[in-house]
Interface confidence: medium
Amino acid sequence: SEVEYRAEVGQNAYLPCFYTPAAPGNLVPVCWGKGACPVFECGNVVLRTDERDVNYWTSRYWLNGDFRKGDVSLTIENVTLADSGIYCCRIQIPGIMNDEKFNLKLVIKPAKVTPAPTRQRDFTAAFPRMLTTRGHGPAETQTLGSLPDINLTQISTLANELRDSRLANDLRDSGATIRIG
């Protein structure tokens, strides 16, 4: 089931998706698509990165974070009601059944009459939390051996966590790092 995120018409929507490269530059290709994740790749691609850079994007869709550190969260600028729907973030690790794919549901609400806050960046719902492995320490690390040397830590998003977007902003701005391993 998809995790739900909300934004208002005219605001920027934020759909979180993360992994942790072993080192900046050791990147895994990532695609963002409109619609649920298919078997391979992304459908209706809106943005794509390769091992080095963002190599495809469409207007209003961009990565606001440092994708070279694994922050591949999608920002959708100036959203309209038509932007509602499911979005797929896919971390394209080599191997069948090895991709990490996440379906995120974006719900766009009509704009409020009240003036928008000065802080424009809209962390629409849950600040993502890391999935842990039962019986372990705080979380898990995946090493991709002889493939691109990645400690993959794609973080699943849980909609009921840290719903206060101001808190999410504060956490983010205070330099809190979400790193597994």
């Epitope: 078997v39 690790i93 080599p94 191997g95 069948i96 059944m97 090895n98 991709d99 990490e100 794919k101 999935l131 492995t133 898990e140 690390t141 995946q142 090493t143 991709l144 051996g145 002889s146 493939l147 993959l152 830590t153 794609q154 699943s156």
Partner: antibody, heavy 119, light 110 residues
């Protein structure tokens, strides 16, 4: 060389539960997706479940969804299959297998462990 | 309930060639080049013989070859030998992100 050593099979009553284990060695375990395949006595192979290298993305055959749970512990190089609400038709030899990275195949298999569901 | 269709048995004399078929749909065999073939002797674990329709893993004899046309994959064993007598299973990745197998073909060396 790649080794997959299985344990955890046995005789279980209908409705019971069982956890199968598969200890891996000889390869970078967390790099590879893994699968469970079963074979009922005198029958063919049936893929039942798979899991991504990180352990965060599980896959299930429709026939076992809701009753089987696949998991892995990359620190211990181990793969698990938790089976609940066991039925007579779950009686089979269960194999763990390593998914190849570059092909769609299962190149390495465990020795198999027999699960018998009977009252 | 096996999704892929295989003949129940095939037989041949030593030195002959036999071809095993595996028929699926556009959602599995026809849709992806992720067709594999496995050999299984009684009481043993399956052994990968062919991957990705026609690729032979190292250590597998070149007497084994694979191909695909449309929704049907084939395994050909040439120069049949006594040790080839076994059950052979085809498998395919599917559009549901799962694997499916055939019911298996018993190869008998006469």
């Amino acid at each position: 060389q790649v080794q997959l050593v299985q344990s955890g099979g046995g005789l279980v009553q209908p409705g019971g539960s069982l956890r199968l284990s598969c200890a891996a060695s000889g390869f970078s375990f967390s790099t590879y997706a893994m699968s469970w395949v079963r074979q009922a006595p005198g029958k063919g192979l049936e893929w039942v479940s798979g899991i991504s290298g990180s352990g965060r993305t599980p896959y299930y055959a429709d026939s076992v969804k809701g009753r089987f749970t696949i998991s892995r512990d990359n620190d211990k190089n181990s793969l698990y299959l938790q089976i609940t609400s066991l039925r007579a038709e779950d009686t089979a030899v269960y194999y763990c297998a390593r998914n190849d990275i570059f092909t769609g195949s299962l190149p390495d298999w465990g020795q198999g462990t027999l699960v018998t569901v009977s009252s | 309930s096996y999704v892929l269709t295989q003949p129940r048995s095939v037989s041949g004399s030593p030195g002959q060639s036999v071809t095993l078929s595996c028929t699926g749909t556009s959602s599995d065999v026809g849709g992806y080049n992720y067709v594999s073939w496995y050999q299984q002797h009684p009481g043993k674990a399956p052994k990968l013989m062919i991957s990705d329709v026609s690729a032979r893993p190292s250590g597998i004899s070149n007497r084994f070859s694979g191909s695909k046309s449309g929704n049907t994959a084939s395994l050909t064993i040439s120069g049949l030998q006594a040790e080839d007598e076994a059950d052979y299973y085809c498998s395919s990745f599917t559009s549901s992100s799962t694997y499916v197998f055939g019911a298996g073909t018993k190869v008998t060396v006469l």
